[in-house]
């Protein structure tokens, strides 16, 4: 007689929400083997028993975590095989803060993995990478673990955050760092990675200060795992601390991109214009708060943006997009600072 379990591993990791069938079978020379699963708190219908075999269906719910045992008997002989089932959750939901790094500043970067299970520091590890290497000199602050707010009762998922203090990024600064989160499970290693672009000075390796006027470009190296392209900012940087600088421009590098000018005399009006030949249009796509609360005038290759009612510009990021091509220019206005043109 033969006793078989398929898959044969003694430990199985199952992604939450996915199903897995474990088939236990036994052939018997004298009659039919009796096969059954025990030791798992299964709801009705998760075990299907047939002559000589039993199929355990794991539905990827936390309640499926455990160590069921398949017992097969044939006459006076019996066999058993235990399977340790671990249900895990590790979606590609990494959030980094800040959204970009500024060379020359002592800063803290955080990386949060959302909707994680198990929330075990021994199975989840964080790394801050420069290229494919761990960033030398970064100091890991204490990790944080919090339960996610669930819409319904049931699976308690967690978010885990690791923060690092960054060393000086050097000159020239690297184009980007990456947060890499690895979940190590039995016979399974899963990794997600999120890029953190680094601001690059076009004209000077010195750290930015409150009076220099050179623009800052957001550069990015793309990786297969990175979620954002890095060249288009589509959301505001998360809360301070971003640098209190004179207005800086972040832009996608390319042969032609829009320019942003500020007009103090027009009551803090911003002008975005493109000079990339005929057929080009520009429009405002991002401003602090709600873009709808601003006064906009768009006329082909020029677009104006001003505050209603007239007053100083709100502190934050403004973005202008050019079509066709989708190139963007981003201007950071720190508020109450002498304005500069973008480059």
């Amino acid at each position: 007689q033969s006793f078989q379990v398929n898959p044969p591993e003694s430990e199985v990791a199952v992604a939450m929400g996915t199903s897995l069938q474990i088939t236990c079978s036994m052939s018997c020379d004298e009659g039919v083997a009796r096969v059954h699963w025990r030791g798992l708190d299964t709801s009705l219908g998760s075990v299907q028993t047939l002559p000589g075999s039993s199929i355990l269906s794991v539905r990827g719910m936390l309640s499926d975590t455990g160590t069921p045992v398949c017992v097969g008997s044939c006459g006076s002989r019996s066999f058993q095989h235990s399977v340790k089932i671990l249900v895990y959750a590790f979606p590609d939901q990494l959030v980094v803060s800040p959204e970009f790094l500024v060379p020359g500043q002592d800063q803290v970067v955080s990386c949060t993995a959302h909707n994680i299970w198990p929330a075990d520091p021994n199975s989840l590890s964080f790394a801050l990478l420069l290229g494919e290497q761990r960033l030398e000199g970064a100091q890991a602050l204490e990790p944080e673990q919090e339960e996610e707010i669930q819409e319904a009762e049931g699976t308690p998922l967690f978010r885990m955050t690791q923060r690092w203090r960054l060393p000086s990024l050097g000159t020239p600064a690297p184009p980007a760092l990456h947060c890499q989160v690895t979940m190590q499970l039995p016979k399974l290693v899963l990794t997600h990675r999120k890029e953190i672009p680094v601001l690059q000075s076009q004209t000077s390796p010195k750290p930015p200060n409150t009076t220099s006027a050179e623009p800052y470009i957001l550069t990015s190296s793309s990786t297969a795992e990175a979620v954002s392209t890095g060249l288009n900012i589509t959301t505001l940087p998360s809360a301070p601390p971003y640098p209190k600088l004179s207005p800086r421009t972040l832009s996608s590098e390319g042969p032609c991109r829009p320019k942003i000018h500020q007009d103090l005399e027009a009551g803090w009006e911003l002008l975005c214009e493109a000079s990339c030949g005929p057929g080009v249009t520009v429009r405002w796509t991002l401003a602090p708060g709600d873009l709808a609360t601003y006064h906009k005038r768009e006329a082909g290759a020029q677009a104006w943006l001003s505050v209603l009612p007239p007053g100083p510009m709100v502190e934050g990021w403004f973005q202008c997009r050019q079509d066709p091509g989708g190139e963007v220019t981003n201007l950071y206005v720190p508020g109450q600072v002498t304005p500069n043109s973008s480059s």
Epitope: D106, G137, Q139, A140, R165, L166, P167, S168, P241
Partner: antibody, heavy 119, light 107 residues
């Protein structure tokens, strides 16, 4: 000259409270993360807390978490440690120390202030 | 937490001796290690940072080496003012932790 000077130590009964201060001079205080480190009589050094330059980040050793609170007043160039629910094992010399940006070692230490918890 | 283990816990040496103190981390800390000297009744004084960089004003007879988990502090020629307790400290991750100390005494 860069200097740190602790004060506020003394004798306190178990369960009591004490507030330590650390006056900083000779450097731009707000640019630096600061630490409290203690040393029990005849023992080694034990880090107990840090605070970032803008007070945005703080952390504590497990041995004092929930009882001690670190804070700073950058306008007064002063670091504080509020110690509540004191225990006999908190008896130690308490040092404040400055953290070196980008490298994170403690490059400047105060002379220390002695806290004795005894009934 | 990262444990730091110093050895020996104490040693006796004479002026002019070469003294070596070792420090081992329970996991890799790259080069995020500092060495401090402390004399009785005084505050610790930084000697070495980043495993091997000499702090300004510290005599060149002090040197540090190592990376990863194993580190060494060497005093090339012991001077009378060097009799003290020496601590290593990792600052790779929080909580930062110190070794238990090595007391250098006069033989």
């Amino acid at each position: 000259e860069v200097q740190l000077l602790e004060s506020g130590g003394g004798l306190v009964q178990p369960g009591g409270s004490l507030r330590l201060s650390c006056a900083a001079s000779g450097f731009t205080f707000s640019d630096f993360w600061m630490h409290w480190v203690r040393q029990a009589p005849g023992k080694g050094l034990e880090w107990i807390s840090y605070i970032s330059g803008d007070s945005g980040y703080t952390n504590y050793a497990d041995s004092v978490k929930g009882r001690f609170t670190i804070s700073r007043d950058n306008s007064k160039n002063t670091l504080y440690l509020q110690m509540n629910s004191l225990r006999a094992e908190d008896t130690a010399v308490y040092y404040c120390a400055r953290d070196r940006p980008y490298y994170y070692y403690m490059d400047v230490w105060g002379k220390g202030t002695t806290v004795t918890v005894s009934s | 937490d990262i444990q730091m283990t110093q050895s020996p816990s104490s040693l006796s040496a004479s002026v002019g001796d070469r003294v070596t103190i070792t420090c081992r981390a329970s996991q890799s800390i790259s080069r995020s290690l500092a060495w401090y000297q402390q004399k009785p009744g005084k505050a610790p004084k930084l000697l070495i940072y980043a495993a091997s960089s000499l702090q300004s004003g510290v005599p060149s007879r002090f040197s540090g080496s190592g990376s990863g988990t194993d580190f060494t502090l060497t005093i090339s020629s012991l001077q009378p003012e060097d009799f003290a307790t020496y601590y290593c400290q990792q600052y790779k991750s929080y909580p930062v932790t110190f070794g238990q100390g090595t007391k250098v005494e006069i033989k």
